[in-house]
Amino acid sequence: MDSFNYTTPDYGHYDDKDTLDLNTPVDKTSNTLRVPDILALVIFAVVFLVGVLGNALVVWVTAFEAKRTINAIWFLNLAVADFLSCLALPILFTSIVQHHHWPFGGAACSILPSLILLNMYASILLLATISADRFLLVFKPIWCQNFRGAGLAWIACAVAWGLALLLTIPSFLYRVVREEYFPPKVLCGVDYSHDKRRERAVAIVRLVLGFLWPLLTLTICYTFILLRTWSRRATRSTKTLKVVVAVVASFFIFWLPYQVTGIMMSFLEPSSPTFLLLKKLDSLCVSFAYINCCINPIIYVVAGQGFQGRLRKSLPSLLRNVLTEESVVRESKSFTRSTVDTMAQKTQAV
């Protein structure tokens, strides 16, 4: 990899237009940004506002309940993952506005763009944990009565976070900053050296572990849960189904473009028209995936209103009812009584 520094003594004689002046990071490729980049900026702005405020509120509501309510632990962790990812958005936004110039240094280049992947893995792993919890509540209620506790929930979350960090390492390691001489700017990007196989391997692992495998396992898991719920004629089974569908749908909708473009670009020749088109859509796909970071609080509010008709309640109160309702372990009723907390599902579908 290139050693990176901000001075270019060898090129000092390149005057006027030719000077690499990193203090004026202007890529004047055209006077305006490309349409996909403009759309990405709009999405980033909305996600930042909704994501920071919404997830901060969720953290505030669940933090007080996390000691005694397991569902609160799940939602707290999901909200933290989303909140952390949202913190990178002002930097990513600024970079796109400057035609992807990156004046923030190497450490920021490694960390900030990797946060969305950390969020993806953390969310998916937490969703798997919540799904396992839902499954056990329905199929192993006695086990839950004996062993399901806050301590175990925190351990499960810690394991999920640890695995998520491990899975994000490749993205972190391969990110570098590099000077571009024409147009003059600094770029933050992924460098797999010239090894296309390594790039493909990373893309495949990301697709399988971050998308296909969780999708398969969660679909199977919830199919069993819903079949059991229906067979017991649970009072809220249709509402449970709606939440589950919302979870799976959001997972598909928001991560699919990112995953598909990622895997396609790793297999396509860089000069092919398809590759070039996908490259132009890169920022838009990332921003689309980022919607996951703000969608959970919206789903909680919608679900809270839909299930309880609490339109007149304050937002924190509504969220508290949705996020901290504890499961009562009584066979299938244990599931239906706390149907709302299947929302946990959604949150990590992201």
Partner: antibody, heavy 124, light 108 residues
Framework: EVQLQQSGPELVKPGASVKISCKAS????????MSWMKQSHGKSLEWIGD????????IYNQKFKGKATLTVDRSSSTAYMDLRSLTSEDSAVYYC?????????????????WGTGTTVTVSS | EIVLTQSPTTMAASPGEKITITCSAT???????LHWYQQKPGFSPKLLIY???NLASGVPARFSGSGSGTSYSLTIGTMEAEDVATYYC?????????FGSGTKLEIK
């Protein structure tokens, strides 16, 4: 089919100027930056400079500053190179070649399509 | 300026023979920025290999590239008559972009 069609051979007198054209077809002209290269008879290639077709921004090899001027006409998808104050040293084949500029990630500056070449002969 | 020196300058090979051309740089280059071109007599150069080891579209699999730092090589697994050409390496990492001195490959 992607093509870079260059203008025909030029025979010019020392001290004169010449304008070589490179017409692009088969792709979006503004997606690729254009480079120009010089190849003297029996010798290797020398990079002259690059031009951004979107706005005309350019960068030159210091060796060719004052000798070459790069311009574009977006409406006709054509790149031009002006060579002035010609001497026998400027007798060569000149090529245009495109390279893709990635806005959001590293560009590696390899020339995937080359022009047909324009032979410039400077002789009195 | 990074100077690229190719060796050999000229070489003659028999059909079926394995050929290796080397390209040496005066300072280290990231392997992503080293490319190879083929120029047949009377024609324009053509991209052969980009980013050290990736074959350009339509290039036969008998061509391969490798290397890192200051030392790179182009290999033709089994020489064929149509491979008669001059081969150039090129670096795109620094300004000015530079080409190797060229290796002329002939057939015995």
């Amino acid at each position: 089919e992607v093509q870079l069609q260059q203008s025909g051979p030029e025979l010019v007198k020392p001290g004169a100027s010449v304008k070589i054209s490179c017409k692009a077809s088969g792709y979006t002209f503004t997606d690729y930056y254009m480079s120009w290269m010089k190849q003297s008879h029996g010798k290797s290639l020398e990079w002259i400079g690059d031009i951004n077709p979107n706005n005309g921004d350019n960068i030159y090899n210091q060796k060719f500053k004052g000798k070459a001027t790069l311009t574009v006409d977006r409406s006709s998808s054509t790149a031009y190179m002006d060579l002035r104050s010609l001497t026998s040293e400027d007798s060569a084949v000149y090529y245009c070649a495109r390279w893709y500029y990635y806005v959001s990630s590293f560009s590696y500056w390899y020339f995937d399509v080359w022009g047909t070449g324009t032979t410039v002969t400077v002789s009195s | 300026e990074i100077v690229l020196t190719q060796s050999p300058t000229t070489m003659a090979a028999s059909p079926g023979e394995k050929i290796t051309i080397t390209c040496s740089a005066t300072s280290s280059i990231n392997s992503n920025y080293l490319h190879w071109y083929q120029q047949k007599p009377g024609f324009s150069p053509k991209l052969l290999i980009y980013r050290t080891s990736n074959l350009a579209s339509g290039v036969p699999a008998r061509f391969s590239g490798s290397g890192s730092g200051t030392s790179y090589s182009l290999t033709i697994g089994t020489m064929e008559a149509e491979d008669v050409a001059t081969y150039y390496c090129q670096q795109g990492r620094t300004i000015p972009r530079t080409f190797g001195s060229g290796t002329k490959l002939e057939i015995k």
